[in-house]
């Protein structure tokens, strides 16, 4: 054996080294990697040192027997059967109240012939529960509402008005309050006939002046 090189590096079970035929001189770096389903135990990078010894002990390739942490899901809690997620472990996701689960609630860590163990599914999502709209209120008798829709989304406001000669009793505007279920902030108002005195006192008399006869007017008629 030469005395100016590091010792020959062997192949390792269930893995390989690169380069496969390294020069064994000082400064040479050799990297060990494992086949799918195995992971490096020890240092994967070895370097030929000044004193012609390798910087680290030879690593080994160990079978991967667990899944990676599938992670937390926003707006949820999770129940874990085994903290290191070995094959057979389960993770159950439960959405916080007001959120709806999209995907699988329970994931199971499964072994695979080739490659590392894998979760039965990807982590789910917890989406905000859709707030139900408020049902449209009918316009008060002798009045109107705007907008005139059958369903009003949570947060929307509707406005009420009364026909001439009627006054509004109640709230002129009411809101669809978001909730489970969504609900109107107030009962719908009513339109009450104004007293005749009040009706006349509240109005001034406008006299409209008729336009002078003109050829334009004649033409229009």
């Amino acid at each position: 054996p030469r005395n100016d090189t590091c010792p020959e590096l062997p192949e390792i079970p269930n893995g390989w080294k690169s380069p496969s035929q390294p020069e064994l001189v000082h400064g040479t770096v050799v990297t060990y990697q494992c086949y799918p389903g195995y992971q490096v135990v020890g240092s994967s990078v070895l370097m030929c040192q000044w004193d012609l010894t390798w910087s680290e002990d030879l690593p080994s390739c160990q079978r991967v027997t667990s899944c990676h942490d599938p992670g937390d899901v926003e707006h949820s809690r999770r129940l874990i059967s085994s903290p290191k997620f070995p094959v057979g472990a389960t993770v159950q996701y439960i959405c916080d109240q007001g959120f709806v689960l999209m995907g699988s609630s329970i994931l199971t860590c499964h072994d695979r012939q080739a490659g590392s163990p894998k979760w039965s599914d990807r982590a789910p999502k917890c989406l905000l529960e859709q707030l139900k709209p408020c049902h449209g209120l009918s316009a008060p008798e002798n009045g109107a509402r705007s907008p005139e829709k059958q369903l009003h989304p949570a947060g929307a406001t509707i406005h009420f008005s009364c026909a001439p000669g009627y006054v509004l009793k109640g709230q002129a505007s009411i809101k669809c309050v978001p909730g489970h279920p969504s609900h109107w902030s107030d009962p719908p108002p009513i339109c009450r006939a104004a007293s005749l005195d009040g009706f006349y006192n509240s109005r001034s008399l406008d006299v409209a002046k008729a336009p002078a006869a003109s050829s334009t007017l004649d033409a229009a008629h």
Epitope: L79, Q92, Q97
Partner: antibody, heavy 120, light 106 residues
Framework: EVQLQQSGPELMKPGASVKMSCKAS????????MHWVKQNQGKSLEWIGE????????GYNQKFKGKATLTVDKFSSTAFIELRSLTSEDSAIYYC?????????????WGAGTTVTVSS | QIVLTQSPAIMSASPGEKVTMTCSAS?????MHWYQQKSGTSPKRWIY???KLASGVPARFSGSGSGTSYSLTISSMEAEDAATYYC?????????FGSGTKLEIK
Amino acid sequence: EVQLQQSGPELMKPGASVKMSCKASGYTFTDYNMHWVKQNQGKSLEWIGEINPNTGGTGYNQKFKGKATLTVDKFSSTAFIELRSLTSEDSAIYYCTRGGYDHYWYFDVWGAGTTVTVSS
Amino acid sequence: QIVLTQSPAIMSASPGEKVTMTCSASSSVSYMHWYQQKSGTSPKRWIYDTSKLASGVPARFSGSGSGTSYSLTISSMEAEDAATYYCQQWSSTPPTFGSGTKLEIK
């Protein structure tokens, strides 16, 4: 009738561990998650964590991680809570309580509670 | 975590009187649940999903609210209603409880 029967009171020394039990009857044990709630003397309630009796899966309030361990014995329909490294702060009533079926956000049946007193 | 503040902390009411207690959340929640606890006993589920009465709860009880403001109302106080009432949310993990309203009979 659905019942949760809890073990008797415990008088413990600081630094010790205690394990309490909660035996369920009157329903299918594996259909409902079991929760544990702490109530300090004359104070409010704190959720410790829960366990799914079917999978053994557990979830904890961050505050009680490392303090409490939840387990179940499916065959005897019993849930357990173990508290370690006890201090006077752990003196309280501990309730086991059942989560709602397919409705995981409230507690529908409660045990009578186990009183734990930590004193030297 | 969401903090639930109950008010008043202590209140008293005469038989037949209307009683309202409130639970205010530090962040918006979707639903609120309420528990009744009498001295020396464990809590009982009383109102769930904001307004649904648990089995056996008298119809004089009602619950309402949305967002950060919820309330429990007794339309006509009776002696057996004297207890401490706790609100609870799970719109965010961990679930949290209010500090309780102690209701006494005058």
